[in-house]
Interface confidence: low
């Protein structure tokens, strides 16, 4: 079989809300993936599992099941949302994210995603990791690729 390519495109949007009393930030982060089927037969995208890390702590997880099928030599763009919570030992971030004297409150998050595809009973998993900027101070819609954070820690692709 030929390859199935998974490309993490970036953060599409981030919607934020706060709990003042608990000093907690809730971020709903929607990400975009391109999945390309280089085969001459259809494949099923069985599930997508994703998690988001901040400062090496997992702050959100999501799983999508029975998502779609991709035809031969075809590509599909898939959006998935991960609800995240920045709280407890990270509640110090609340002050930064609600600081009104600055306009952009970017934090660096690590996006991890694993796509499971199946064809002819065979299952294949492809994983990606990317560091992304997300504004935790207001609702933001990003141009694809706009939120990318490049640094020496980013895994080689």
């Amino acid at each position: 079989p030929r390859s199935i390519d998974v490309k993490y495109i970036g953060v599409k949007s981030a919607y934020v809300s706060y709990d003042v009393q608990k000093r907690t930030i809730y971020l709903n982060i929607t990400n975009t993936l391109n999945i390309t089927n280089n085969n001459y037969y259809s494949v099923e995208v069985e599930n997508i599992t994703a998690q988001v890390q901040f400062a090496k702590t997992v702050i959100g997880k999501a799983r999508l099941n029975n998502i779609t099928h991709i035809g031969p030599l075809d590509m599909k763009q898939i959006d998935y949302t991960v609800p995240t919570v920045i709280a407890e030992e990270m509640s110090y971030m609340y002050d930064f994210c609600t600081l009104i004297s600055i306009k952009v409150h970017n934090i660096v998050l690590m996006m991890q995603v694993t796509v499971t595809t199946t064809y002819f009973g065979h299952s294949e998993q492809i994983s990606q990791e990317r560091y992304q900027y997300v504004d935790c101070g207001r609702n933001t819609t990003y141009q694809l690729g706009q939120s990318e954070y490049l640094n020496v820690l980013q895994p080689q692709q």
Epitope: V16, S17, V20, Q21, T98, L99, I100, S101, R138
Partner: antibody
Framework: QVQLQQSGPELVRPGTSVKVSCKAS????????IEWVKQRPGQGLEWIGV????????DYSEKFKDKATLTADKSSNTAYIQLSSLTSEDSAVYFC???????????????WGQGTSVTVSS | DIQMTQSPSSLSASLGERVSLTCRAS??????LNWLQQEPDGTIKRLIY???SLDSGVPKRFSGSRSGSDYSLTISSLESEDFVVYYC?????????FGGGTRLEIK
């Protein structure tokens, strides 16, 4: 219940400055922003700026950056606006209002003070 | 800055009549809009937040809605105490901006 009690009317000379207060009660002062709004006689409402009483951080409308200074005293649950180099254009009613803790997210300005009239005249 | 264009600037209506006031936003503000009421003595009260949510204690005859960039405040049946001034306020971005106001007068 939530109350924002503003100081009384002021009659001040041109070129001087004035400080208007807004005393908050009935809620946790540092959990909310205090916003300030100007209303000239017979005119509409104009946003001046906002202060986070917890840390003292401020955000001003460009128009009022050199005119207004916002401060807050956590110990007395009171916010202040100081207006400097006063001219007749500054004659107005000044309102304080309370908002949730982010200037970008939330329902904004849920409770208002009664307003303080500032008259600049020689 | 986001401009909020409020119309009409004044409106004459009769008791029991249904009226609508409109604010148009120059940029996308989502649902981040309030409607405020100002009494003749200057007192300001929030009637509606987040475009359509009624504040507690506000009579049910007040309602808010949105169509694209147009935001409306509707009073279903005018009562004598409703003949005051109304403002919209956007809080989607800093600086917050107000509509120019609508003075509601009794016919």
């Amino acid at each position: 219940q939530v109350q924002l009690q503003q100081s009384g009317p002021e009659l001040v000379r041109p070129g001087t400055s004035v400080k208007v207060s807004c005393k908050a009660s009935g809620y946790a002062f540092t959990n909310y922003l205090i916003e300030w709004v100007k209303q000239r006689p017979g005119q509409g409402l104009e946003w001046i700026g906002v202060i986070n009483p917890g840390g003292g951080n401020t955000d001003y409308s460009e128009k009022f950056k050199d005119k207004a200074t916002l401060t807050a005293d956590k110990s007395s649950n009171t916010a202040y606006i100081q207006l400097s180099s006063l001219t007749s254009e500054d004659s107005a009613v000044y309102f304080c209002a309370r908002s949730p803790y982010s200037s970008y997210v939330g329902y904004a300005v849920d409770y208002w003070g009664q307003g303080t009239s500032v008259t600049v005249s020689s | 800055d986001i401009q909020m264009t409020q119309s009409p600037s004044s409106l004459s209506a009769s008791l029991g009549e249904r009226v609508s006031l409109t604010c148009r936003a120059s940029q996308d503000i989502g649902s981040n809009l309030n409607w405020l009421q100002q009494e003749p003595d200057g007192t300001i009260k929030r009637l509606i937040y987040a475009t359509s949510s009624l504040d507690s204690g506000v009579p049910k005859r007040f309602s808010g809605s949105r169509s694209g960039s147009d935001y409306s405040l509707t009073i279903s049946s005018l009562e004598s105490e409703d003949f005051v001034v109304y403002y919209c306020l956007q809080y989607a971005s800093s600086p917050r901006t107000f509509g120019g106001g609508t003075r509601l007068e009794i016919k």
